[in-house]
């Protein structure tokens, strides 16, 4: 039976949401010894490297100079070592931003809170959009996906410290393709806790609201900043 | 309908203790924050603090922070605040108030008043 | 703290005529900025949410406008159960803060 080699990694600089008109590098990370990558986009051939010397090499990037709504979409790759292919990357989902129109995001009660209060944040855009997406800055992303017809509600429900932090939304015009992001929102979560059965850095979000809670595993692999790339995207699976 | 029955009134004397409790019904207590605002005869408002019943999380004026001490009781719903080391100042109506992104429903107040 | 000052302190206005009251954040708060209404002897009551979104039960008279450090109420016509004072308060940052409030009589 024919083995294949282990995946790759596959992720993009700075980052995978990359506004309009503007640089990405998609890197893909294999083995020493590869004679060739292959990225592929939308299940197709888009690219191929082969480095130079294969045996003190074990990444390949390519480079897309000018953004756009053609180049948005889901990224693998594969790598040979002589004839033998890896496994595929996962999925890498570069999403082009700054289309359109600019959302506004607002939190409620207030951006400063008492720890346990219920808080919930709405990001508005007015151009025809259904969904909406609520991000948190950091090296765990949260990604909260939320629909409406003009606003989407995302409640966080009670929240602890762990929640402190700026957050910003953008509306969706198809998976890959995303509004400005709104101007950021910092949350303050204050308050002395007597008697919690919440732990303070353990956010617990409501199974049916939050899409994934997302922190990576190939954290050794990767970059501090290649980190939300490699997690966060997972939302759009 | 939301109500919040506050208790009644107390005459206190300087550098004694004080504790006014507030009992909630028509909602569920442990899903708002309460707070407590505090009213001198023929002045503003003044916010004092507020807790979170579900875990407990207190958040404190500063000008109060060591004097005041806001406690609540899920299986009453009734939220207390305790005011020690009264001063003739301290003379005023204090209000529980629900934060439901405003403070929309309000107790009907408790006038303490301090006086030697 | 946010300081939040409200002007004028004292507005006398005739019945079914128009009042304005302002209310001035020290910094920007947004439309975190909540109104209340308080008549002699009882607590205050909510009449406008964020700056400018109406409360259920609240005649629709009443209305807010505003956004950053400037904000306003406004009761179109003035019906005689509306002399009263009115607070501001600030929603975006503990501590929470009021406005020293604004007396509306009757002129």
């Known amino acids: 039976q024919q083995q294949t080699l282990p995946k790759p990694f596959i992720w993009a600089e700075p980052h995978f949401m990359v506004p309009k008109e503007k640089q990405v590098t998609i890197c893909c990370q294999g083995n020493y010894g590869a004679v060739e990558y292959q990225l592929h986009f939308e299940g197709s051939l888009f690219a191929v490297d082969r480095p130079k010397p294969p045996e003190r090499i074990n990444k390949v990037q390519f480079y897309i100079p000018d953004m756009n709504s053609r180049m948005a979409g889901q990224y693998s790759c594969i790598y040979r070592v002589g004839e033998l292919w890896s496994e595929p990357s996962n999925l890498l989902d570069l999403v082009v931003t700054e289309m359109y129109d600019t959302p506004t995001l607002s939190v409620h009660p207030g951006p400063e809170v008492i720890s346990g209060e219920k808080v919930t944040f709405y990001c508005r855009l007015d151009t025809a959009t259904s969904m909406f997406l609520l991000l948190k800055e950091g090296r765990s992303s949260h990604v909260q996906r939320g629909y409406g017809k003009v606003q989407a509600e995302f409640p966080l429900g009670p929240v602890t410290t762990a929640h402190r932090g700026t957050y910003r939304c953008f509306g969706s015009y198809n998976n890959h393709a995303w509004s400005f992001p709104s101007e950021p929102v910092k949350l303050l979560v204050t308050g002395d806790i007597e008697n919690t059965s919440l732990a303070p850095e353990d956010p617990t979000f409501p199974a049916d609201t939050w899409g994934t809670y997302l922190l990576t595993t190939e954290t050794g692999l990767q970059k501090d900043h290649a980190l939300w790339d490699h997690t966060a995207q997972n939302l759009l699976r | 309908q939301v109500q919040l029955v506050q208790s009644g009134a107390e005459v206190k004397k300087p550098g004694s203790s004080v504790k006014v409790s507030c009992k909630a019904s028509g909602y569920t207590f442990s899903e708002y924050t309460m707070h407590w605002v505090r009213q001198a005869p023929g002045q503003g408002l003044e916010w004092i603090g507020g807790?979170?019943?579900?875990?407990?999380?207190?958040s404190y004026n500063q000008k109060f922070k060591g004097r005041a001490t806001i406690t609540a009781d899920k299986s009453t719903s009734t939220a207390y605040m305790e005011l020690s080391s009264l001063r003739s100042e301290d003379t005023a109506v204090y209000y529980c108030?629900?934060?439901?992104?405003?403070?929309?429903?309000w107790g009907q107040g408790t006038t303490v008043t301090v006086s030697s | 703290e946010i300081v939040m000052t409200q002007s004028p302190a004292t507005l006398s206005v005739s019945p079914g005529e128009r009042a304005t009251l302002s209310c001035r954040a020290s910094?920007?708060?947004?439309?975190?900025l909540h109104w209340y209404q308080q008549k002699p002897g009882q607590a205050p009551r909510l009449l406008i949410k964020?700056?400018?979104q109406s409360i259920s039960g609240i005649p629709a008279r009443f209305s807010g406008s505003g956004s950053g450090t400037d904000f306003t109420l406004t009761i179109s016509s003035l019906e005689p159960e509306d002399f009263a004072v009115y607070y501001c308060?600030?929603?975006?940052?503990?501590?929470?803060?009021f406005g020293q409030g604004t007396k509306l009589e009757i002129k």
């Open positions: 308060q600030n929603g975006h940052s503990f501590p929470l803060t």
């Open positions: 807790i979170s019943p579900n875990i407990g999380g207190t």
């Open positions: 910094q920007s708060i947004s439309d975190y």
């Open positions: 108030a629900r934060r439901g992104g405003s403070f929309d429903y």
């Open positions: 964020y700056a400018s």
